[in-house]
Amino acid sequence: GATAGTIDTKRNISAEEGGSVILQCHFSSDTAEVTQVDWKQQDQLLAIYSVDLGWHVASVFSDRVVPGPSLGLTFQSLTMNDTGEYFCTYHTYPGGIYKGRIFLKVQESSDDRNGLAQFQTAPLG
């Protein structure tokens, strides 16, 4: 089990549809070194970072997920379907496995909420 470090993360974050958000898990340890980091949903991988191979972003997210800052991810062009749980997994040596969970709530953009740009009036005549 994990004995030599901690993961800190915001458990709940929100962002606007069409906007972007940073998914970040902060790992701290005096002794363990990170060898690999996974970012995933229940059944979909977002990205993997490994010390030897660097970043690998899953193809389905490659146009919307940018590695960083640090070992986090910047998730862009958010849609309502992106609402849900995201898991970070830090594989470390010799400390073991450390995990974090983030719930992302994607909200309608403020323009939509205010009813702007909903209707276009046709010119008379």
Partner: antibody, heavy 119, light 106 residues
Framework: EVQLVESGGDLVQPGRSLKISCVAS????????MAWVRLAPQKGLEWVAS????????HYGDSVRGRFIISRDNPKNILYLQMNSLGSEDTATYFC????????????WGQGTLVIVSS | NIVMAQSPKSMSISAGDRVTMNCKAS??????IAWYQQKPGQSPKLLIF???NRYSGVPDRFTGGGYGTDFTLTIKSVQAEDAAFYYC????????FGSGTKLEIK
């Protein structure tokens, strides 16, 4: 829709070799760690081997290490299991499955292919 | 390597009853456990990951619990279609399965 289809199962004599395959579709194969898991008659599930998304890192269960080789062909979307020095204890249905991340839970499974080792 | 011991080996339960099965790890595995259901002639299905997270689409009568070395899978009101083998699996490092629990419905 994610699909995993195993093939190549056969009746084989003890000491011989066999290579089974799994064709993946409905997702980007090269993004995911993959695994082989087997179910032997009157026994439970046994993890056999897993391989990283790019193929350079492999992991094996104790009972097959040194005899079996897991590999993948990402351009063809195929996962392989080369089984050497087969014994009767290797008789099982072999399932191909997809990890979500690194060596974690298995959401998607194939229907299995039967390997029988007998003289 | 860590060994996953499941108990009981089999159980026979009436529909509507509550059932709990156990999985014990030989060493601390934190919450790095998944549970699967497998019916004869079918592929296994993921029920629970990280010991207590229900996979999407899994009925809420299935609940996972535990941490460290002792884990449980509870079915709060067993249905006829729940007759199956249930396996725990240690995830990461060496993804070992337990020996399984067979659930029969009376």
């Amino acid at each position: 829709e994610v699909q995993l289809v195993e093939s190549g199962g056969d009746l084989v004599q003890p000491g011989r070799s066999l290579k089974i395959s799994c064709v993946a579709s409905g997702f980007t194969f090269s993004d995911y760690y993959m695994a082989w898991v087997r179910l032997a008659p009157q026994k439970g599930l046994e993890w056999v081997a897993s391989i990283s998304y790019e193929g350079s890192r492999t992991h094996y269960g104790d009972s097959v290490r040194g005899r079996f080789i897991i590999s993948r062909d990402n351009p063809k979307n195929i996962l392989y299991l080369q089984m050497n020095s087969l014994g009767s204890e290797d008789t099982a249905t072999y399932f191909c499955a997809r990890h979500t991340g690194t060596l974690d839970w298995l959401v998607y499974w194939g229907q299995g292919t039967l390997v029988i080792v007998s003289s | 390597n860590i060994v996953m011991a499941q108990s009981p080996k089999s159980m026979s339960i009436s529909a509507g009853d509550r059932v709990t099965m156990n999985c014990k790890a030989s060493q601390n595995v934190d919450n790095n456990i998944a549970w699967y259901q497998q019916k004869p002639g079918q592929s296994p299905k993921l029920l629970i990951f990280y010991a207590s997270n229900r996979y999407s689409g899994v009925p809420d009568r299935f609940t996972g619990g535990g941490y460290g070395t002792d884990f449980t899978l509870t079915i709060k009101s067993v249905q006829a279609e729940d007759a199956a083998f249930y396996y725990c699996q240690r995830i990461y490092n060496f993804p070992t399965f337990g020996s399984g629990t067979k659930l029969e419905i009376k």
